[in-house]
Every structure is written in structure tokens, then in C-alpha cells.
Interface confidence: low
């Protein structure tokens, strides 16, 4: 068992030419989330087949709306990680399908409408418990930046999550040949000899003696790619001449679970509900007691002095399951008042608070204001947590130092030509149109669209704008 | 890909003083949050400090007034300070950095580059 981990980087316009329009609005405010489908293997499967590895949906991005006539940058992420918890062995080879989705927030009738932006596929080779990859898709216009992992859940440990950590036996090293399970460095892989010359990469073993191929290998020591042109079934154990998946039994065909234990199918393989005082992944493993060390992490074990007896696992903070072997998710309280980010530092939880916001957990709302000084003149407004100044005319900029050219957004209408003053601008307007910014006709007879011209200001004089 | 080089670990007496550096180099297309972490023998890997792109600094309780994380963005360098080093900080020490998604956040934890480590000793 483990969990494959999606985090999205950044979703936003690919490079080169055509960059796509963004897609909120000021009239049309929207947020993004994603969905990642995942199928075993390297098939290349419809959109629409299941996602047999299992799918994950994100939470929604912060709320975004678009500046007119600016081009899309890249669009606000949800917080967090995609999830995909998978049962069994991971299959080491797996196709991925990532969409992009936008929840439009205008006032549509019957809520939020949903829409597809744009959806990635790619087929990957991927061992668990190794470092993040990293990946582009781009889909049209759009550029997608992620990264992945498939990482064990304990006891399961390896490249496909099949082999098993057990506690110590001894306090100081594990047995002969067997390594610690990193990074359980307390706890030691349990000894499991595959068949010899089992490939390592495409192989694995639940029984010693055994070798198992992972999803697209074949042959008695798993060395061979399945070939899929010529095979007709899905199901069953390889070929290893032909190279070819043919019919064969079913995994809890002839029970493997041992002790009593009862078999129920899953997707690719099989699961053992064992009974009491035996576990395992075919329930083999017999009479757990506190003696043999059932709690992970540190647990303390409670009763369970003969086999017959049930124990229970007392867990320390931040560790759940009955054996201790789950870490609580303390972010998942939401512990950060006001917007504030949770981490989970492990030995401590933090909160990473909004601008203007303070405390150990966002709890104080700071003086925007205070402390800020806004340069030449301007004003300090507070609001939303974050200062802003108003600057005084003619500069600009988060705290008013750089000067501003009143030009830039050419004010003057009608063709009147801009001249920047200290106190300013100056439109000099074209003949036939006055005012502040040149916005009036002179009518043919004289008569302006104004009221009246200012005294000793004739129409076409250059008006200052203050 | 990005690589990272730790260097500046040694041996070193209690209270004394060391500086470590972390040269960054490789696609740099994001601005980063960096960490030091730690792992010392038979413990588990742990936080020692960390700075957001924006500058912003956090320190486990353990290191604080001792230690000071800074960083240099002409360089692409990350720097650890270590003051009145005391003989639990023997330990391997990681530099870390993590390009996590938007708004220049640390998300502790979900590091997608580390170092190889180098080594602080801190014994008599």
C-alpha cells in the first residue's frame, strides 16, 4: 500500500506565440482546480476508461479576475498535494491523465459552472519511495508544471511496495543481510529471499522463493516485456515465451490466505481478512503480543500478553491507526486562523500568516499602517490586511517612490498632445476640442459643450490638468 | 533538475562557531524556499531553519538565537550560521529547497531537492 503524490507548480501560458486569452474576467470570476486520473501500466487508454490506480479531485484555487486587456499569467494554485492512495503493489509503470478545471463564479443560475481548460496524458516509469520527478505538459496554448511521486505507506517499503518492515529484534542493528527501513530507521526489512536471479526493478515476492512480475513484465524471473499486439486477454499469470498475458486463475483462486483467513479480489491481486492473533499479508504471521513490538512510532503496546489476547497500540502525538502506523494530518484542523498556511514541521506545527497578520497561529490582525511610511506626500490607507498608499500626483509605486509619468496612459483625447508638469499634466488640445483632457467639441458657431469656458481661457489653449 | 552543494561542516568545539553554504545550480525557473535540515545518528531527519523568497525566516526552537538562515539570490546561496554550537547539534546537515506552487510559501516537508549533506562534529 502507499500513496502516489501529485503537486501542481504553476498552470499558466506555454512559451511562443499565441498566448491564450486568460480564462476569468472581471465579469466572469473564476478559480481553478485539477483532477488526476491514474491507470496501471503503459496502456493508452480512452479518457473516459476507469482510472483503475484510483483518481484525486484538489480543492479550489483562490478566487481570480482577470485585468482588462492583459494577457494570462500564471493562474493562482490550490494549496496542497494530490493524493492517490493505492491499495496494492504499485505497478512501477502507470499512465496519468491531469485536467485543468475552471469554476466559474459569476451569478449563473443553480450555482457554479464547471468547465474543461485543459487536459495532459503521459505514460511513466516510476519507483516508489524515490525522489519527486518532475514534468511540463503543455496542452495547446497552455503550460502545466508538476511533480510526482509514489512513495510506501508502513510497514510496505521498496520500489513496488511490497516488501515489509518489522521492529527491531535486536536495539542496536537488524539481522544478517536484512537493512534498516528507511527512513523507519528503528525498524528492519523483513526477510524475504525472492527466487534467485528475480529482477529487482520488475520483480518482487510475497513468499521466499517466489518471483512476481510487475504490471508489463513477463517469464520466470520477470525479465521479459509483455508484448500486447499479439495477446487477446488481460488476465492471468505471463507467458514467458510468447511474452503474453494469457487466461489464467484468479488471485484468491486455491485461498492464499493462511490460518482461516478469508480472500477478497482487488484490481490486481488479492487482499486476506485474517482472524484474530494472526496477520500478515496472507495472515502466515502468527501470535502477536506486546513482545513482539506491534506498535510503530513509538507506540506503547497494552496488553496482548499471550497470543490469545488482544493488544492495543497507545500512539503518540501526530500517529494514528491501530498500530500506530498512520501520521495524522494535524493541518487538517485547520489550526491557521485568516488565511494563514499550516506546516507540519513534524517535531511542531507553524502557521505561515497573510500579510498584516500575526501570532502563532494568524490570530493578531496587525496595523496595517503602522510603521509604513508612504514616500512624497503619499497616504497610508489600511484594508485587507495589507497597506496600500495613496500617492500624491505625479507618483506612484507601492510606496510612492518612483515618479510617475502622467503621460503614460495618454489622457489627452481627440488627438491633443500630453506634456508633463511638476504639478501634473498639460493637454494641448487639437483645434476644435478643449478641455482638462481635450474631451469637448468647440462647436462650428463657437459654443462649446461646456457651460463656459474658464475666464481668459480660450478653446485650443493648453489646459492644465491638476 | 537543480543540485546542491553543502559545504563548511567540521569539527568543532563546544561553543564555537561554523558556517555552512549550500550552492544552488540547475533550472531555476521559480523562486524558492530553502531549508536546513538535520539528522543525527539513530534520530530522525528534522527542521532547523528555513527562508521564503520574500525573505521571511522561521527557526526550530532548538536552534533559535543560535543559528541564522540567510540566503543570497545574486549567488543562488544558502548560508547557516551556527553560534554556541552545543554537542546535540553533532549531526549531517541538508540543505533543502522546495519550488512549492504559488505565493512564495515554505511547505515544510514536501522538499523536492536535497544535498548530499556534510557533517558538523561538535565535540571537546
Known amino acids: 500500500a502507499g500513496v502516489f503524490e501529485l503537486q501542481i507548480h504553476s498552470f499558466g501560458p506555454g512559451p511562443g506565440p499565441g498566448a491564450p486569452r486568460s480564462p476569468c474576467s472581471a465579469r466572469l470570476p473564476c478559480r481553478l482546480f485539477f483532477r488526476v486520473c491514474l491507470k496501471p501500466g503503459l496502456s493508452e487508454e480512452a479518457a473516459e476508461s476507469p482510472c483503475a490506480l484510483g483518481a484525486a479531485l484538489s480543492a479550489r484555487g483562490p478566487v481570480y479576475t482577470e485585468q482588462p486587456g492583459a494577457p494570462a499569467p500564471d493562474l493562482p494554485l490550490p494549496d496542497g498535494l494530490l493524493q492517490v492512495p493505492f491499495r496494492d503493489a504499485w505497478p512501477g509503470t502507470f499512465s496519468f491523465i491531469i485536467e485543468t478545471w475552471r469554476e466559474e463564479l459569476g451569478d449563473q443560475i443553480g450555482g457554479p459552472a464547471w468547465s474543461l481548460l485543459a487536459r495532459v496524458a503521459g505514460r511513466r516509469r516510476l519507483a516508489a519511495g524515490g525522489p519527486w520527478a518532475r514534468d511540463i505538459q503543455r496542452a495547446g496554448a497552455w503550460e502545466l508544471r508538476f511533480s510526482y511521486r509514489a512513495r510506501c505507506e508502513p510497514p510496505a517499503v521498496g520500489t513496488a511496495c511490497t516488501r515489509l518492515c518489522r521492529p527491531r529484534s535486536a536495539p542496536s542493528r537488524c539481522g544478517p543481510g536484512l537493512r534498516p527501513c528507511a527512513p523507519l530507521e528503528d525498524e528492519c526489512e523483513a526477510p524475504l529471499v525472492c527466487r534467485a536471479g528475480c529482477s529487482p526493478e520488475h520483480g518482487f515476492c510475497e513468499q521466499p522463493g517466489e518471483c512476481r512480475c510487475l504490471e508489463g513484465w513477463t517469464g520466470p524471473l520477470c525479465t521479459v516485456p509483455v508484448s500486447t499486439s499479439s495477446c487477446l486477454s488481460p488476465r492471468g499469470p505471463s507467458s514467458a515465451t510468447t511474452g503474453c498475458l494469457v487466461p489464467g486463475p484468479g488471485p484468491c483462486d486455491g485461498n492464499p490466505c493462511a490460518n482461516g483467513g478469508s480472500c477478497s479480489e482487488t484490481p490486481r491481486s488479492f487482499e486476506c481478512t485474517c482472524p484474530r492473533g494472526f496477520y500478515g499479508l496472507r495472515c502466515e504471521v502468527s501470535g502477536v503480543t506486546c513482545a513482539d513490538g506491534p506498535c510503530f512510532n513509538g507506540g506503547l503496546c497494552v496488553g496482548g500478553a499471550d497470543p490469545d489476547s488482544a493488544y492495543i497500540c497507545h500512539c503518540p502525538p501526530g500517529f494514528q491507526g491501530s498500530n500506530c502506523e498512520k501520521r495524522v494530518d494535524r493541518c487538517s484542523l485547520q489550526p491557521c486562523r485568516n488565511g494563514g498556511l499550516c506546516l507540519d514541521l513534524g517535531h511542531a506545527l507553524r502557521c505561515r500568516c497573510r500579510a498584516g497578520f500575526a501570532g502563532p497561529r494568524c490570530e493578531h490582525d496587525l496595523d496595517d499602517c503602522a510603521g509604513r511610511a508612504c514616500a512624497n506626500g503619499g497616504t497610508c490607507v489600511e484594508g485587507g490586511g495589507a497597506h496600500r498608499c495613496s500617492c500624491a500626483l505625479g507618483f506612484g509605486g507601492r510606496d510612492c517612490r518612483e515618479r510617475a509619468d502622467p503621460c503614460a496612459a495618454r489622457p489627452c483625447a481627440h488627438g491633443g498632445r500630453c506634456y508633463a508638469h511638476f504639478s501634473g499634466l498639460v493637454c494641448a488640445c487639437a483645434p476644435g476640442y478643449m478641455g482638462a483632457r481635450c474631451e469637448f467639441p468647440v462647436h462650428p458657431d463657437g459654443a462649446s459643450a461646456l457651460p463656459a469656458a474658464p475666464p481668459g481661457l480660450r478653446p485650443g489653449d493648453p489646459q492644465r490638468y491638476l | 533538475e537543480v543540485q546542491l552543494v553543502e559545504s563548511g561542516g567540521g569539527l568543532v568545539q563546544p561553543g564555537g562557531s561554523l558556517r555552512l553554504s549550500c550552492a544552488a545550480s540547475?533550472?531555476?525557473?521559480?523562486?524558492?524556499?530553502m531549508g536546513w535540515f538535520r539528522q543525527a545518528p539513530g534520530k530522525e531527519r528534522e527542521g532547523v531553519a528555513d527562508i521564503v523568497s520574500d525573505g521571511s525566516t522561521s527557526y526550530a526552537d532548538s536552534v533559535k538565537g543560535r543559528f541564522t538562515i540567510s540566503r543570497d539570490n545574486s549567488k543562488n546561496t544558502l548560508y547557516l550560521q551556527m553560534n554556541s554550537l552545543r554537542a546535540e547539534d553533532t549531526a549531517v546537515y541538508y540543505c533543502?529547497?522546495?519550488?512549492?506552487?504559488?505565493?512564495?510559501?515554505?511547505?515544510?516537508?514536501?522538499?523536492?531537492?536535497w544535498g548530499q549533506g556534510t557533517l558538523v562534529t561538535v565535540s571537546s
Open positions: 540547475g533550472d531555476t525557473y521559480r523562486s524558492y524556499c
Open positions: 533543502a529547497v522546495d519550488r512549492g506552487g504559488s505565493g512564495g510559501y515554505c511547505y515544510t516537508g514536501r522538499y523536492d531537492y
